[in-house]
């Protein structure tokens, strides 16, 4: 003859409030005669969970019937979970006898926790902008969760970080917690397109982790690289000099032409272009009236960048006497 | 629905033997245990015994055993309690009830000669 | 056998005022036994409180129940006439089971 075992597999049932936990009980025998009952606790102070035969379980069904001959299965559910019912759940064998039922065998138990998903995580960036090749700080917040394991990790474009610090809060026993996450991350020229993520796995998400993002063009300011240059060609009595402002980030910028130190008011032409990288290209072109008495003047192209500190660029032009004396149309 | 109806008002005389049934619907009472109560008039509530109707086990209080058995049928659904050697103190309520929470409309058993 | 003896037999109270009712067991019993059922003149009882402090469906909210090893207690935190009833309290930790003698409670 076998001897009884009673099976329950999960030594820890994590459940959220106010949904159903299943907890498993099978046995390997159906002897000796005599019910299982469902205990919360061990000891003369135990709570009983579930008795087929008497007493008043309304949130209590069972997973399969128990009337039916030969069943060895004597799992239940318990409706409406509340924090009141976290604890650790024995099935117990009972053994038929007079005048009382004598306990035969217990199941190993099964720990029921209270399991909260956490937050969304919230990723936050540097509150001003910083260049290239210079370390920036994102944090990471997420709450609200329970049990306290947590795993949290952090991607650069999906390489992963290493340098971050995270706390989990509170170190003691509560009902949910929250972890906050501070990375490191050096800034490269490229970035404007970069992403910082976020990445929070708990028992609870099921192998499912939640992700928060953070673009790196809120915290990127790549400054601009300028270049003067005259164009080769005369228009009539003008001469097309051009300022290109090359590899910049964010688009906010301010141009201004000074000749001689005079800053000059009249319309200029321009155009912006976005480059694959995410920076964009500022070209501006100004046209200077050539007479005789002009041989040294100096042009200057000054750009403010996101509210930083003006740079320019200087031009001497050069006006040869055959640009003097030409007086063809030609298109620079 | 859940619903015990019991056997109809008994007058019995001293020493006499009676049979009260109940009757259940909603429920096979082969999956429960199903109780006797007394309710004497003006008294309160007495446990008489219980049967678990798939075995036909019983439990009986020690101040009606020997006087009491409790059966079941369980192709009728129906559990019953005979009380022998009936005296007048006999004279009360009967109760069935299933599991402890929902009971029957109750018998009265008279004894008097 | 367990005795459960109730206190007081009869309790005189007006609607809206807060009733104890009392139920002391000659030894311990696991809270998960301890119930309290209702009577009414000419009816079966009704099954009231399960397991020491849970109310039974369609119980109203002013009825609570606490209490563990021999003291128990069930409360009513402001009277309705409808209240007024005999009130058991039973256990059925072990054989043989037992009812407590019942409070009456009546109307002052």
């Known amino acids: 003859e076998e001897e009884l075992q009673m099976i329950q597999p999960e030594k820890l049932l994590l459940v959220t409030v106010g949904k159903t936990a299943t907890l498993h009980c099978t046995v390997t025998s159906l002897l000796p005669v005599g019910p299982v009952l469902w205990f919360r606790g061990v000891g003369p102070g135990r709570e009983l969970i579930y008795n087929q035969k008497e007493g008043h379980f309304p949130r209590v069904t069972t997973v399969s019937d128990l009337t039916k001959r030969n069943n060895m299965d004597f799992s239940i559910r318990i409706s409406s979970i509340t924090p009141a019912d976290v604890g650790t759940y024995y099935c117990v064998k009972f053994r038929k006898g007079s005048p009382e039922n004598v306990e035969f065998k217990s199941g190993p138990g099964t720990e029921m926790a209270l399991g909260a998903k956490p937050s969304a995580p919230v990723v936050l960036g540097p509150a001003a902008r910083t260049t290239p090749e210079h370390t920036v700080s994102f944090t990471c917040e997420s709450h609200g969760f329970s049990p306290r394991d947590i795993t949290l990790k952090w991607f650069k474009n999906g390489n992963e970080l290493s340098d971050f610090q995270t706390n989990v809060d509170p170190t003691g026993q509560s009902v949910a917690y929250s972890i906050r996450s501070t990375a490191r991350v050096v800034l490269d020229p490229w970035d404007v397109r970069s992403q910082v993520i976020c990445e929070v796995a708990h028992v609870t998400l099921q192998g499912d982790p939640l992700r928060g993002t953070a673009n790196l063009s809120e915290a990127i300011r790549v400054p601009p690289t300028l270049e003067v240059t005259q164009q080769p060609m005369r228009v009539g009595n003008q001469v097309n000099v051009t300022c290109q402002v090359r590899k910049f980030y964010p688009q906010s910028l301010q141009l201004t032409w000074s000749e001689n130190g005079n800053v000059c008011q009249r319309e200029t032409a321009s155009t912006l272009t976005e480059n694959k990288d995410g920076t964009y290209n500022w070209t501006s072109w100004f046209l200077v009236n050539i007479s005789d008495q002009r041989d040294d003047v100096v042009l200057t192209c000054q750009v403010k960048h996101d509210g930083q500190l003006a740079v320019s660029k200087r031009l001497a032009l050069e006006v040869t006497v055959h640009q003097k004396d030409q007086s063809s149309d030609a298109t620079p | 629905e859940v619903q015990l109806v019991q056997s109809g008002a008994e007058v019995k005389k001293p020493g006499a033997t009676v049979k009260i049934s109940c009757k259940a619907s909603?429920?096979?009472?082969?999956?429960?245990?199903m109780h006797w109560v007394q309710q004497a008039p003006g008294k309160g509530l007495e446990w008489i015994g219980r049967?678990?109707?798939?075995?036909?086990?019983?439990k009986y209080a020690p101040k009606f055993q020997g006087r009491v058995t409790i059966t079941a049928d369980t192709s009728t659904n129906t559990a019953y309690m005979e009380l022998s050697s009936l005296r007048s103190e006999d004279t009360a309520v009967y109760y069935c009830?299933?599991?402890?929470?929902?009971w029957g409309q109750g018998t009265l058993v008279t004894v008097s000669s | 056998e367990i005795v459960l003896t109730q206190s007081p037999a009869t309790l005189s109270l007006s609607p809206g005022e807060r009733a104890t009712l009392s139920c002391s067991a000659s030894?311990?019993?696991?809270?998960?036994?301890l119930y309290w059922y209702q009577q009414k003149p000419g009816q079966a009882p009704k099954l009231w409180i399960y397991s020491t402090s849970n109310l039974a469906s369609g119980i109203p909210a002013r009825f609570s129940g606490s209490g563990s090893g021999t003291d128990y207690t069930l409360t009513i935190s402001s009277l309705e006439p409808e209240d007024f009833a005999v009130y058991y309290c039973h256990q059925w930790s072990s054989y043989p089971y037992t009812f407590g003698q019942g409070t009456k409670l009546e109307i002052k």
């Open positions: 009830d299933r599991g402890l929470a929902y």
């Open positions: 030894s311990s019993v696991s809270s998960s036994y």
């Open positions: 909603g429920f096979n009472i082969k999956d429960y245990y």
């Open positions: 049967i678990d109707p798939e075995d036909a086990e019983t």
